[in-house]
Interface confidence: medium
Amino acid sequence: TQNKALPENVKYGIVLDAGSSHTSLYIYKWPAEKENDTGVVHQVEECRVKGPGISKFVQKVNEIGIYLTDCMERAREVIPRSQHQETPVYLGATAGMRLLRMESEELADRVLDVVERSLSNYPFDFQGARIITGQEEGAYGWITINYLLGKFSQKTRWFSIVPYETNNQETFGALDLGGASTQVTFVPQNQTIESPDNALQFRLYGKDYNVYTHSFLCYGKDQALWQKLAKDIQVASNEILRDPCFHPGYKKVVNVSDLYKTPCTKRFEMTLPFQQFEIQGIGNYQQCHQSILELFNTSYCPYSQCAFNGIFLPPLQGDFGAFSAFYFVMKFLNLTSEKVSQEKVTEMMKKFCAQPWEEIKTSYAGVKEKYLSEYCFSGTYILSLLLQGYHFTADSWEHIHFIGKIQGSDAGWTLGYMLNLTNMIPAEQPLSTPLSHSTYV
C-alpha cells in the first residue's frame, strides 16, 4: 500500500550500487530544513536486487528491465508518492563494470544505456548511471563512515551514542572490499602523499583534509580468487588442482574459458592441454596464505614505502572501518568482535579451513554452496591483504573495526556519493560552497 505523505518536511534520495557480484538499492531520508547539518541523512531501506552484477548482462541486456523492477517498485512503495518527482536516483557502477569497460567500451556503454533507459521509466528524478572511478569509490566510502560517525562536526549529533567513539575528531580510515576491487583510504599523519594519483584534498565543514586513497583493481575477493586459480593451474601437472584454500573433500570443475574470461587473469594466461580442470580442496590455511601472497608483488617500490605492485602507501594512521566484504566475510566467520586478536583470527581460520566440506555443508545448510565454499579463501585473503598487503600488524589489528552498519546506515560508498551529488556536504561551517563533484576527478 502507498504510504501517505509525512507531515514533517523530509526529502529522499536513491542510490543503486551496481557492484561486480550484485546490485543493491539504498533509500536515504533527511529533514529538508537540516540538509547541510552533518549526520542527519540516514538509510531507510536496502533492497538487494536478485541476480548477478550488471556486467553479467552484457549478452542479455533485454533482461535488465526485470532485473531492476522489484527494487524500484519497492522504492515506489517506501517513498510517498508526493515525493517521487523530486527524489533523485543515482546509479554508480564499480569494478565489475570497470573490467567490462577494459574489455570493451562499447559493451559497457550498451549495458549502461539499457540501465539508464530502464531507470528513466520510473517516476523519480533520474540523474544518470555511470561507472565511478576507484578513487571516487574510496573517497565516498571514507566520507560515508566519517559522516555517520560524526567526525566532520563538533555540533551535537542527531544520535546519542556513536559506536567506535574516540575522544577526538580524528577521522577513521576506510577499508572497502568488493568482489573485483579493494580500496584503502585514510588521512596520513604529517606525511607527504608521494604519488599525486593517490592524493585527495577536501574542505568539509570548514576543515581541510589531505586524504590518501588507492583502489586495487582485480584485488576484490572474487577476482583475487580467479587470479590465484590462474596462477596455480600454471604449475599443476594435470587437470587436478589440489587447492589449500578449499575445504578437504570439496570438488569443483572449472572451465578454462571462464578462468581466462576476466582481464584480471591475463598475466597468468597460458595454453593449457585441457579445457576443464577440477579443484580438489585440501584445506590448509598456511599453504593457502602462501599461495595468496604470490599475488602481491612486493619486490618493487619506487616510493619510500609501498603496499604491493609498486603502489605508494603511507604509514597507517589511526582507526579504520573495514566494511562491505571485509565485514560480511568476517561476520560469517564470527570474527568481527573487537576482542578477537589477529593471532586468534589466524587460529580460527586454520581450524575453519581444515574442516571437511561435508561437515561444513551440514553446519551451514541454509547458505548458498558457492558462497559457503569460498569463505576459507576469503577469510585467508582478508588476513593476507590486511597484514602483508596493507602492513597492519598484530598490534595495529585492534585499530580495525569491522563495520556493517553505523546507526542503521550501511557503511559503503553510496551515502557519500549521494551527499556529494546533492551538495549536502558544505565546505564551510555552517554553510558555503558545496564540495564539487570534480574534486574526485
Partner: antibody, heavy 119, light 109 residues
Framework: QVQLVQSGAEVKKPGASVKVSCKVS????????MHWVRQAPGKGLEWMGR????????KYAEKFKNRVTMTSDTSTNTVYMELSSLRSEDTAVYYC????????????WGQGTMVTVSS | DIVMTQSPDLAVSLGERATINCRTQ??????????MNWYQQKPGQPPKLLIY???SLASGVPDRFSGSGSGTDFTLTISSLQAEDVAVYYC????????FGGGTKVEIK
C-alpha cells in the same frame, strides 16, 4: 544443484487448515522469489502467491488473499504455505517454485504435495 | 489479473510442426522486455521451463522448441514433434506477478 523438497501428502477435513513446507538445498532461499502454484486433478496451473524471503514480503493472488499465508525460515532454508478454511475445491497438488532470476536460465520446482479435502 | 487464453488441444504427426498460441488480455511488455514464458508438463511431474522472455530458450531445452511474439500475441513452436514432446503446454506471464494460460494438450496424430 538446487533441489526443492516438499512435505508429504495431507488429508484434511473441510474448514481445517493445511501447512505445506518446501525445503531448498544447494542455494539460499534469499536468492529467489519463492512462488506457490496449485493444480486441481485434471486441471491447469493456478498461481497462489509469492514470498521474497530476503525481506519477508508477500504478494498473493486476489482469490487467495484472505485464506493464504506464506512464510519463510532462512535458518532452515524453508518456505511454508498455509491455506485455511479448506473446502473440497482446494483438493489439488501444491507446488513450490523459484522464480527464474534474471541472469540465470533456469527455475526450480518442488515435486508437489497432494492435499485432499474430504469429509 | 492478466487473463490468458490458449489455443485448443492439438494432434500432430511425428516429425511435423506443432504451433500453440497464447493471447493475453493486456500487454506483457514492460520497459522494452516481454515477460512471457512457456512450460511443458508431463503427467505426475512438475512443470518444466522451456522458453523465457518470449523467445529465449531455457538451458537444456532442445532447439526444436522456439517462442515468438510480443505485446499480447504469442506462439510456441515445436519444429519437428518427437514422441517425448507429448505433454500439456502452458503459457505464463510474469510481467505482473504470475498468471498461467489454461494449457494446451499436444498428442500424436
Amino acid at each position: 544443484q538446487v533441489q526443492l523438497v516438499q512435505s508429504g501428502a495431507e488429508v484434511k477435513k473441510p474448514g481445517a487448515s493445511v501447512k505445506v513446507s518446501c525445503k531448498v538445498s544447494g542455494d539460499s532461499i534469499t536468492a529467489y522469489f519463492m512462488h506457490w502454484v496449485r493444480q486441481a486433478p485434471g486441471k491447469g496451473l493456478e498461481w497462489m502467491g509469492r514470498i521474497d524471503p530476503d525481506h519477508e514480503r508477500t504478494k498473493y493472488a486476489e482469490k487467495f488473499k484472505n485464506r493464504v499465508t506464506m512464510t519463510s525460515d532462512t535458518s532452515t532454508n524453508t518456505v511454508y504455505m498455509e491455506l485455511s478454511s479448506l473446502r473440497s475445491e482446494d483438493t489439488a497438488v501444491y507446488y513450490c517454485a523459484t522464480e527464474r532470476v534474471p541472469g540465470f536460465e533456469t527455475d526450480y520446482w518442488g515435486q508437489g504435495t497432494m492435499v485432499t479435502v474430504s469429509s | 489479473d492478466i487473463v490468458m487464453t490458449q489455443s485448443p488441444d492439438l494432434a500432430v504427426s511425428l516429425g511435423e510442426r506443432a504451433t500453440i498460441n497464447c493471447r493475453t488480455q493486456q500487454t506483457v511488455d514492460h520497459y522494452g522486455t516481454t515477460y512471457m514464458n512457456w512450460y511443458q508438463q508431463k503427467p505426475g511431474q512438475p512443470p518444466k521451463l522451456l522458453i523465457y522472455l518470449a523467445s529465449s530458450l531455457a538451458s537444456g531445452v532442445p532447439d526444436r522448441f522456439s517462442g515468438s511474439g510480443s505485446g499480447t500475441d504469442f506462439t510456441l513452436t515445436i519444429s519437428s514433434l518427437q514422441a517425448e514432446d507429448v505433454a500439456v503446454y502452458y503459457c505464463q506471464q510474469s510481467r505482473n506477478l504470475w498468471t498461467f494460460g489454461g494449457g494446451t494438450k499436444v498428442e500424436i496424430k
